[in-house]
């Protein structure tokens, strides 16, 4: 007897983090034997949509014309072949930005930092929020989360980095969010350029758990160090 059908691959274009009002296309890729594709959204009546495969039948397209809060969430897809339905795909988390006003991102003591020294990136929101995210441009896995304990609302989060190396240099933005839906983020902060000077061959930090933040073959881990921030937020790694 044949084993279970392989699970399809699910992805979003242009990406899974979409600004309010922008369009997004969700693709589900199965096999050439697929006869039908189905997309389910968590906490929505199933199926969210069904589509016939596009030639050569190994994938289907699901579309969102203009991103709103209602589309944010977790999706899975399946395909049906002559022998039955496939396993579900790995989940796709579709995140909408623009749900809240943008926070302010600053560097303490300065965005100009010498290699080996310390710097703290500070993300501040006008209204109290319970989750803050730091993103580095062109990062492979860019999300650094700070989430408050017990839903406590905070106006800011600190992302300390020490010791700073050349890999920490680059452009950062931050977002804020409420815990009731981590699929809804604020507008992005204005970009902050962190400039690291005085190093050619810096020692690289080697944390046990890291978030990769540089793109391509230069991928290096970025692990803010130091104590849990004063704001009462605990570090949460995605």
């Amino acid at each position: 007897q044949a084993g279970p059908l392989p699970k399809p691959t699910l992805w979003a274009e242009p990406g899974s983090v979409i600004s309010w009002g922008n369009s997004v296309t969700i693709w589900c890729q199965g096999t050439l034997e697929a006869r039908e594709y189905r997309l389910d959204k968590e906490e929505s009546p199933a199926p969210w949509d069904r589509q016939n495969p596009l030639e050569p039948k190994n994938k289907a397209r699901f579309s969102i014309p203009s991103m709103t809060e209602d589309y944010a969430g977790r999706y899975r897809c399946y395909y049906r072949s002559p022998v039955g339905w496939s396993q579900p795909s790995d989940p796709l988390e579709l995140v909408m930005t623009g749900a809240y006003s943008k926070p302010t991102l600053s560097a303490l003591p300065s965005p100009l930092v010498t290699s080996g020294k310390s710097v703290t990136l500070l993300c501040q929101s006008r209204s109290p929020m319970d989750t803050f995210l730091l993103i580095k441009e062109r990062a492979a896995h860019p999300l650094l989360h700070l989430r408050s304990e017990h839903g406590a609302q905070q106006h800011q989060a600190e992302f300390p980095m020490s010791p700073v190396t050349s890999v920490h240099g680059g452009t950062y933005r931050c977002f804020s969010s409420h815990g009731f839906s981590h699929y809804l983020l604020s507008h992005p902060s204005d970009p902050l350029e962190l400039i690291v000077s005085g190093s050619l061959e810096d020692p690289r930090p080697s944390p046990t758990r890291s978030v990769s933040t540089a793109a391509g073959p230069e991928d290096q881990p970025l692990m803010p160090t130091g104590s849990v921030p004063h704001s009462g937020l605990r570090r949460h790694w995605e």
Partner: antibody, heavy 121, light 108 residues
Framework: EQSVEESGGDLVKPGASLTLTCAAS?????????MCWVRQAPGKGLEWIAC????????RWYASWPKGRFTISKTSSTTVTLQMTSLTAADTATYFC?????????????WGPGTLVTISS | ELDLTQTPASVSEPVGGTVTIKCQAS??????LAWYQQKPGQRPKLLIY???TLASGVPSRFSGSGSGTEFTLTVSDLECADVAAYYC??????????FGGGTEVEIK
């Protein structure tokens, strides 16, 4: 052959309500479509009213000018309605149903012939 | 609320001439702009989508350009069959499908 057709246009008095229906043929609604209503007063330009996503009934988009008087709804996998209340002479127009299509970057690729709504005492 | 300002309101050119219609958005809409042709007494017809892509069956005399807030529709080698009203439209960006005010094209 895919098509849409409007019905329900009528002559009604100011203050009345009216429901227009758009019936799709040759296709059924899915996430790759939105169904939209557009109107055109005599001798005037096109005016967008509302759109609804083919699968997500929570996602309805309205122009600001109807100020809650118009409601777009999906009543089946091939029909959409436009409920209009508190009608005035300014709502006299031909009302078009049109399909917004992901293949055309959400442009309105398929239009009905229109249905005439006249508001007069 | 997004506004689309279309100019001119009307234009008259001889057969074989070129008509240029501009559409300005009050905020950036990327390339989410469509152009429509509506002949007297008929339903509108999609001419161009994604700012510059011709819909199927549309002659190459029609062309669209622009992105962000400034867009242009050009009709070259004008024919009598091109007499119509032309409309620009934001196609769903920022949750609106708003139209411009329209341009009447006539033959001189």
């Amino acid at each position: 052959e895919q098509s849409v057709e409007e019905s329900g246009g009528d002559l009604v008095k100011p203050g009345a309500s009216l429901t227009l229906t758009c019936a799709a043929s040759g296709f059924s609604f899915s996430s790759t479509y939105c169904m939209c209503w557009v109107r055109q007063a005599p001798g005037k330009g096109l005016e967008w009213i509302a759109c609804i996503h083919g699968v997500s009934t929570n996602n309805r988009w309205y122009a600001s000018w109807p100020k809650g008087r118009f409601t777009i709804s999906k009543t089946s996998s091939t029909t959409v309605t436009l409920q209009m209340t508190s009608l005035t002479a300014a709502d006299t127009a031909t009302y078009f149903c049109a399909r917004s299509d992901t293949d055309y970057e959400w442009g309105l690729s398929l239009w009905g012939p229109g249905t005439l709504v006249t508001i007069s005492s | 609320e997004l506004d689309l300002t279309q100019t001119p309101a009307s234009v008259s050119e001889p057969v074989g001439g070129t008509v240029t219609i501009k559409c300005q958005a009050s905020e950036s809409i990327g390339s989410r702009l469509a152009w429509y042709q509506q002949k007297p007494g008929q339903r509108p017809k999609l001419l161009i989508y994604k700012a510059s892509t011709l819909a199927s069956g549309v002659p190459s005399r029609f062309s669209g350009s622009g992105s962000g807030t400034e867009f242009t529709l050009t009709v070259s080698d004008l024919e009598c069959a091109d007499v119509a009203a032309y409309y620009c439209q934001c196609a769903g960006q920022s949750s609106t499908w708003a139209f411009g005010g329209g341009t009447e094209v006539e033959i001189k």
